[in-house]
Amino acid sequence: QEGKFSGPLKPMTFSIYEGQEPSQIIFQFKANPPAVTFELTGETDNIFVIEREGLLYYNRALDRETRSTHNLQVAALDANGIIVEGPVPITIKVKDINDNRPTFLQSKYEGSVRQNSRPGKPFLYVNATDLDDPATPNGQLYYQIVIQLPMINNVMYFQINNKTGAISLTREGSQELNPAKNPSYNLVISVKDMGGQSENSFSDTTSVDIIVTENIWKAPKPVEMVENSTDPHPIKITQVRWNDPGAQYSLVDKEKLPRFPFSIDQEGDIYVTQPLDREEKDAYVFYAVAKDEYGKPLSYPLEIHVKVKDINDNPPTC
């Protein structure tokens, strides 16, 4: 009688958990005349066996991490050894159990971050691997910060993406990190499998040393310019610098002046492009912006203040 565990020779797929000692047959193939014996070939790994009568079984526990799928072929042979049916493909899919620990690729990581870096922008990745199936919770990793040293006012300056292991600054970290006060930090980071959701999960830890570097993206001191300068223009009046080379600089005039007499070059040097007249306008406020190669702002705009100084160029009026 055909059923769950017996039937004719045809392509079939079976799923078996790894790590389990064999407890029952996989399948009993029924022979059609003149088949008197069965033959098993393919990725048997000396684990899978078929008896003459068509009883397919395995003789020891499987390991998915050694082979996740066993591609076998079964043929039915007659008394002369002639294949009379098949060979047909028999696929054994080995189902995963949580039998492997996650492991960090490094026991120690080192990185650096600029003060005032954008919150949530990764500056370092930690990475762990787990040999278990990433399509199951067994191989799904969950990263978290265990300790931050020093911990000032109980405020976390660093955060980690639980899924990717990307480390970035928190909002507080972006605002408060100051290399002059504290130039280095240490994080202890853990990784757990089972998506971090199970008491039975395996874990590993790693250490991360972080150096905080100075942010040179700072607003320059206010500039004072003498009106009606006769020097050749443009004249460099100040500069801004992004923390890394390759930034694209621009100026933003929020006042929408009919005449905006300032420019910036790709070194971050700011120029006045024509003589200024204090009687026309005695102060300018505009912004310097740094963008990446895709035109995305790298940080907040810097406010530039220019004050126009008077010269005695107007007669008194009664």
Epitope: A31, N32, P33, P34, V36, D78, A79, N80, G81, I82, I83, V84, E85
Partner: antibody
Amino acid sequence: EVQLVESGGGLVQPGGSLRLSCAASGFTFSSYAMSWVRQTPGKGLEWVAVIDSNGGSTYYPDTVKDRFTISRDNSKNTLYLQMNSLRAEDTAVYYCSSYTNLGAYWGQGTLVTVSA
Amino acid sequence: DIQMTQSPSSLSASVGDRVTITCRASQDISGYLNWLQQKPGGAIKRLIYTTSTLDSGVPKRFSGSGSGTDFTLTISSLQSEDFATYYCLQYASSPFTFGGGTKVEIK
């Protein structure tokens, strides 16, 4: 409906040759091992040749070995039996029969007479 | 070679009779036995395979049994269309061999 139709039988002199054909239809011929069985009044039914589904393996009993050759053309769904050095005792009705699922399908037979 | 001895070689029976045909192998054939029917016109049909499994479309009045060396084909209630010659066939060992046949005739 499964059909096996033999042809090519007839009268042949001892030492002569004959080629039998069997046209198959109604089943997946290329998946089946096939065979020729003969029936004589004296010896009854006797297996004379077997070929596997792709033509890679053949089997003959000692009575016909080295004289008969079984072959197949799966593209034409046809089985063949080349008979050489024929003897009087090869006189029989020759049946084409499925070997996979042994004896499930049979042709109507073709008569081969070996006589001077 | 394995010899297959069939008995009787012929029998006469009437419609409705119970008919039993036996086949004895010269050695154990592990149940690897088929039963065939050949009508007077020459057409051959398999009735039973692997000792006792009925082919599809074969009436339930036919049954097969046996083990080791002794096997039986039984027709529980003979019908007019059952008058034919019956052969056993062993496929346990090469060369496959047939019994000599049992001709069932009308009494």
